[in-house]
Interface confidence: low
């Protein structure tokens, strides 16, 4: 019988001077057998909660509590979620400045409103800190003799162009 730690299974530890595979104590784990010590399980507390509990062979995994999201590998930090209309800065959640918006809950940055005129369109609905502007249909250019009437159709926001 090979008297070494090489045959130890995960979930155990083994000391070279006394090469016997021993179970990891509670709240410790060993994903590789034959190591001289088991590792202390990660504790998910405070802003963290358990995503996966610790076992003898794998560490606990944490996730952030409601209102926070993970940062870094293995969710090493929790960052506060911002509301729509805000973005996270070093000073915390800040309201989007005029002309910008963020429609995401928790993450994202404030982005500039769409410039409707670049597409030759009019602004149908003004933007807010939470919503982008809504662009209307393209502005059609006609000869001076053409009369244009905009007739509402299908309730608010529904428009058709008729050339009379």
């Amino acid at each position: 019988v090979q008297n070494s730690c090489d045959n130890c299974q995960p979930g155990t530890f083994c000391r070279k001077y006394n090469p016997v595979c021993k179970s990891c104590p509670p709240s410790t784990f060993s994903s590789i057998g034959g190591q001289p010590n088991c590792n202390i399980c990660r504790v998910c507390a405070g802003y963290f909660r358990f995503k996966k509990f610790c076992s003898s062979t794998h560490n606990a995994e944490c996730e952030c509590i409601e209102g926070f999201h993970c940062l870094g590998p293995q969710c090493t930090r929790c960052e506060k979620d911002c509301r729509p209309g805000q973005e996270l800065t070093k000073q915390g959640c800040k309201t989007c400045s005029l002309g910008t918006f963020n429609d995401q809950n928790g993450t994202g940055v404030c982005r500039p409103w769409t410039n409707c005129s670049l597409d030759g369109r009019s602004v149908l609905k003004t933007g807010t800190t939470e919503k982008d502007v809504v662009c209307g249909p393209p502005v059609v250019s006609f000869s001076p003799s053409t009369t244009i009437s905009v007739t509402p159709e299908g309730g608010p926001g529904g428009h058709s162009l008729q050339v009379l």
Epitope: S23, C24, P25, P26, S27, T28, I40, C41, R42, V43, C44, F50, K52, F53, C54, S55, S56, T57, H58, A60
Partner: antibody, heavy 126, light 106 residues
């Protein structure tokens, strides 16, 4: 109030296997470990092992390696223990037990059993 | 494995104070817990981590100790307390129980 319901008494022949069940109600089944404990007539208690129903992870008291197999079914919130190659030494009451504690603590533990099933009597006899 | 030693039986008069001891073969820090088991029933959890009373357990029960020596005290003893009492350690795997102490009435 957490309740653990166990299957009824079993009379089995030596060499055979038996599978007993433990159904959990009013219990965060996937977030708490479930333990199995043996009590021979007139004797003390022996911890067999645990199962984490969340991922099926198990840990056995070395004494029961190969004797007991622990499984769990998340959909029915039921844990099972199969005992194989039965002998008269396996005649006992088997309890399932749980605890309202997180699985990872430092310092160790507390790893106590604060609620228990009523037990299942297994009698091995020819 | 950590062996837990309990005296097999104790006789006590109702209304008196009784202490049930549990000695561990090596230090278990404060990770000792106590259970009560009445005949034909499942164990009932009483005390965790040496001295913390489980909610709903009468205050006449108390626990103390650390390292290797632990005690469960019942003061005063009532007729309803006649049962077996087990200690359990969770400092290392496998978890182990004491052999139990039977509380009897004088």
């Amino acid at each position: 109030q957490v309740q653990l319901q166990q299957s009824g008494a079993e009379l089995v022949k030596p060499g055979s296997s038996v599978k007993i069940s433990c159904k959990a109600s009013d219990y965060t089944f996937t977030s708490n470990f479930l333990h199995w404990i043996k009590q021979q007539p007139g004797n003390g208690l022996e911890w067999i092992g645990w199962i984490n129903p969340g991922d099926g992870d198990t840990y056995y008291n070395q004494k029961f390696n190969g004797k007991a197999t622990l499984t769990a079914d998340k959909s029915s919130t039921t844990a099972y223990m199969q005992l194989s190659s039965l002998t008269s030494e396996d005649s006992a009451v088997y309890f399932c037990a749980g605890g309202n504690y997180y699985a990872a603590h430092y310092p160790p533990g507390p790893w106590y059993f604060d609620f228990w099933g009523p037990g299942t009597m297994v009698t091995v006899s020819s | 494995d950590t062996v837990l030693t309990q005296s097999p039986a104790l006789a006590v008069s109702l209304g008196q104070r009784v202490t049930i001891s549990c000695r561990a073969s090596k230090s278990v820090s404060i990770y000792m817990h106590w259970y009560q088991q009445k005949s034909g029933q499942q164990p009932k959890f009483l005390i965790y981590t040496a001295s913390n009373l489980e909610s709903g357990v009468p205050s006449r029960f108390s626990g103390s100790g650390s390292g290797t020596d632990f005690t469960l005290t019942i003061d005063p003893v009532e007729a309803d307390d006649i049962a077996n009492y087990y200690c359990q350690q969770s400092n290392e795997l496998p978890f182990t129980f004491g052999s139990g102490t039977k509380l009897e009435i004088k």
